[in-house]
Interface confidence: medium
């Protein structure tokens, strides 16, 4: 099943201590899906979309220096025929960068 779209949403982080907000959206015919957010190949967070919505926003607290670095991906799963779980492909990657301090 098709990959979701992924994007950063405001407010954008200005430092590593700021929270990160990442929206993940399935195509229109997959509302209520279960979403997984990965970073650096590891699962960061799991969220289920409301039954009338096709996306979620992951809110990651700042300062989690132990989290793996690298790009984020997301993926969703839906129940198909015979209640079999079907997984989408992974989204394209999205990176988080912080403005260079001016001081």
């Amino acid at each position: 099943i098709p990959a979701p779209s992924i994007r950063l949403v405001p407010p954008y982080p200005s430092s590593q201590e700021d929270p990160i907000h990442i929206a993940c959206m399935a195509p229109g015919n997959f509302p209520g899906a279960n979403f997984t957010l990965y970073r650096g190949g590891q699962v960061v967070q799991l969220l289920q979309a409301p039954t009338d919505q096709r996306g979620v926003t992951f809110n990651l607290s700042g300062g989690s220096s132990k989290a793996p670095g690298g790009p984020f991906h997301c993926q969703y799963g839906v129940l198909g025929e015979l209640n079999q779980s079907q997984l989408s492909d992974l989204s394209e990657p999205v990176n988080v960068s912080f403005p260079v301090p001016t001081w």
Epitope: G40, G69, G70, P71, G77, S85, D89
Partner: antibody
């Protein structure tokens, strides 16, 4: 198109150092991890580790801790493998490999390292 | 460390017949509904080429004659029908945990 171009073959003596380069093009370098794979003559593939091209953090397999170092020159979209204090058992072809969706999708052409006194 | 055992080590298959290669992992390579098992083809003097990623997904540009299946610890690469150009060594690889590991390889000969 996506390409990983590695530096040419190396002939070294035991105890010397070699540094292999891997220049990436055709994609955003920092979006994908870079892995290194060793293949001794006539043998199978052995994963050496990978470097997170976004943070620069390397991860080494146990057999490649100590004498081996991964590094980056991010503005030049280039990854490096350095092997110090070369030994006979380091004689092999080394591949840099892009990681995509956790599989190894684009491979460099390989760099042959010969160790001979 | 996850050990991958491929079988057979070599096989000879007639043109247009089916080739089946097995890869068994010493522990599960599944996480969160994904099977982190991949298959590669390597011809002499060339780098390996990705064929199948995450157990059953066909890499772009790879002929549909190649397919992958399996989950947890048991995986299969199938080539049907085999063509002369398929003579090569095939490797499975897991990326569920570090160290990433490869199977020992299966050499396919076309009769």
């Amino acid at each position: 198109q996506i390409q990983l171009v590695q530096s040419g073959p190396e002939l070294k003596k035991p105890g010397e150092t070699v540094k292999i380069s891997c220049k990436a093009s055709g994609y955003t370098f920092t979006n994908y991890g870079m892995n290194w794979v060793k293949q001794a003559p006539g043998k199978g593939l052995k994963w050496m580790g990978w470097i997170n091209t976004y943070t620069g953090e390397p991860t080494y397999a146990d057999d490649f801790k100590g004498r081996f170092a991964f590094s980056l020159e991010t503005p030049a979209s280039t990854a490096y493998l350095q092997i110090n204090n070369l030994k006979n058992e380091d004689m092999a072809t080394y591949f840099c490999v892009r990681e995509h969706f956790y599989a190894l999708d684009y491979w460099g052409q390989g760099t042959s390292v010969t160790v001979s006194s | 460390k996850i050990v991958l055992t491929q079988s057979p080590a070599s096989l000879a298959v007639s043109l247009r017949q089916r080739a089946t290669i097995s890869c068994r992992a010493s522990e599960s390579v599944d996480s969160y509904g994904n099977s982190f098992m991949h298959w590669y083809q390597q011809k002499p003097g060339q780098p390996p080429k990705l064929l199948i990623y995450r157990a059953s997904n066909l890499e772009s540009g790879v002929p549909a004659r190649f397919s992958g299946s399996g989950s947890r610890t048991d995986f299969t690469l199938t080539i049907d029908p085999v063509e002369a150009d398929d003579a090569a060594t095939y490797y499975c690889q897991q990326s569920n945990e570090d160290p990433r590991t490869f199977g020992g390889g299966t050499k396919l000969e076309i009769k």
